[in-house]
Interface confidence: low
């Protein structure tokens, strides 16, 4: 089943997020992803937990998952590299790098996104953009076209309250508000973009979506700069 989602958002402007990727399993959308280099897509490690022997591919240049678009292209995956410390039962280190079978053909609708290397928290209240093909309502309706929503960053102290995530949010994670607008099932692995820079990746835990007391959790990419660089090298 798809992991993660966009609730309370709207359809994105077509191809305005050329870094956006759909990680697909046997031809169906599974998770979001973000193109970080010509031949590499960053996503969430938990996305491949259910993949087993299925065929994993990456769709780039897409707005609609089903309609023909000149910029769309499906790439095979040469290598999948989950973070070595990721584990099935925790949200920590939930990152995955997918090496495409060849360098992506870049153009206006396909382009890598710079990612944050400076390891400092995004200021609380900063509006960040999250996009994906995840479910758009609690009935589980899946969109065909890319959705997005702007979410304010939530400070870690609030996110770690007993009533919220009760201390689970380490310095390597960040939170965004989730009051009716939220990332959800099918959005996991997708980008949280603040000021035009990739700051976070949607985690793929089975969190309730759209509940303000259960903020969205995102893996801070800056905290994993050394690992990302080592894999991409």
């Amino acid at each position: 089943p798809p992991r993660g989602r966009i609730l309370g958002g709207r359809e994105a402007e077509a191809h305005a997020r050329p870094y956006m990727a759909s990680v697909q399993l046997n031809g169906a959308h599974l998770c979001g992803g973000v193109l970080v280099a010509e031949q590499w897509v960053l996503s969430a490690a938990h996305c491949l937990e259910d993949a087993a022997d299925g065929k994993v591919q990456v769709l780039l240049g897409a707005h609609s998952l089903s309609q023909p678009e000149p910029s769309k292209r499906l790439y095979d995956v040469l290598r999948a590299v989950p973070h070595p410390d990721s584990q099935p039962d925790t949200i920590d280190h939930d990152l995955l790098l997918l090496q495409l079978s060849e360098k992506a053909t870049l153009g206006p609708a396909v382009r890598p996104l710079p990612w944050q290397r400076v390891d400092r928290d995004v200021a609380p209240g900063t509006l960040c953009d999250v996009a994906g093909w995840g479910i758009v309502n609690h009935a589980g309706r899946r969109p065909d076209s890319l959705q997005h929503v702007l979410l304010p960053v939530l400070d870690r102290a609030t996110c770690n309250r007993r009533t919220h995530h009760d201390g689970a949010i380490t310095e390597r994670l960040m939170c965004a508000e989730s009051n009716r607008r939220d990332s959800c099932k099918g959005d996991s692995g997708g980008p949280l973009v603040c000021g035009g820079v990739l700051e976070g990746v949607v985690t793929s835990g089975s969190r309730v979506c759209g509940n303000r007391k259960k903020p969205g959790i995102y893996t801070r990419v800056a905290s994993y700069a050394a690992w990302i660089d080592s894999v991409l090298a």
Partner: antibody, heavy 117, light 107 residues
Framework: QVQLQQSGAELAKPGASVKMSCKAS????????MHWVKQRPGQGLEWIGY????????EYNQKFKDKATLTADKSSSTAYMQLSSLTSEDSAVFYC??????????WGQGTSVTVSS | DIQMNQSPSSLSASLGDTITITCHAS??????LSWYQQKPGNIPKLLIY???NLHTGVPSRFSGSGSGTGFTLTISSLQPEDIATYYC?????????FGGGTKLEIK
Amino acid sequence: QVQLQQSGAELAKPGASVKMSCKASGYTFTNYWMHWVKQRPGQGLEWIGYINPSIGYTEYNQKFKDKATLTADKSSSTAYMQLSSLTSEDSAVFYCATFIYYAMDYWGQGTSVTVSS
Amino acid sequence: DIQMNQSPSSLSASLGDTITITCHASQNINVWLSWYQQKPGNIPKLLIYKASNLHTGVPSRFSGSGSGTGFTLTISSLQPEDIATYYCQQGQSYPYTFGGGTKLEIK
């Protein structure tokens, strides 16, 4: 090594505009934000704003919102700042500084702007 | 905007002395504080980032401490080349703001 080379001193009349440049080398220009800082003679430092050269996204100090315009040319790895409607208050040295690791860790040599009739 | 109040505004000390400059933020900035040194006629140079981390190439006689709203820069065993103006800067939220500076002179 990282270098930021700024354009030369400017002498301008009140009401005029100037555009200064900051050419980056020694790192991937599009991966890091470029900040601009003002220093009036004998005074302290003021943050003007930054640009993300990758997509041209800008963030300004409200104080400079109508004064400064930040742009960047990826092909030449050059950031620009245009100052408009100049007054004597704009006479200052303007620095570009890139935020690569932890703070504004690499600075240009500064561009001096003198506004005089 | 977050105000950064730096003190003292000027300071005179003898070679070999240990001196302390303080910076107070008008609201909590966690550890997002940097210290810069600007020698006369020169450009600012990063000394300390994230309140207490020494930037590459900076002598170990410089140290920083603090978190929240109160921060200090300490220079031990003052050297002639330390004559400069020192600025703190918060990186917690935009707009970034600097302290007013501390001008250090040798007695």
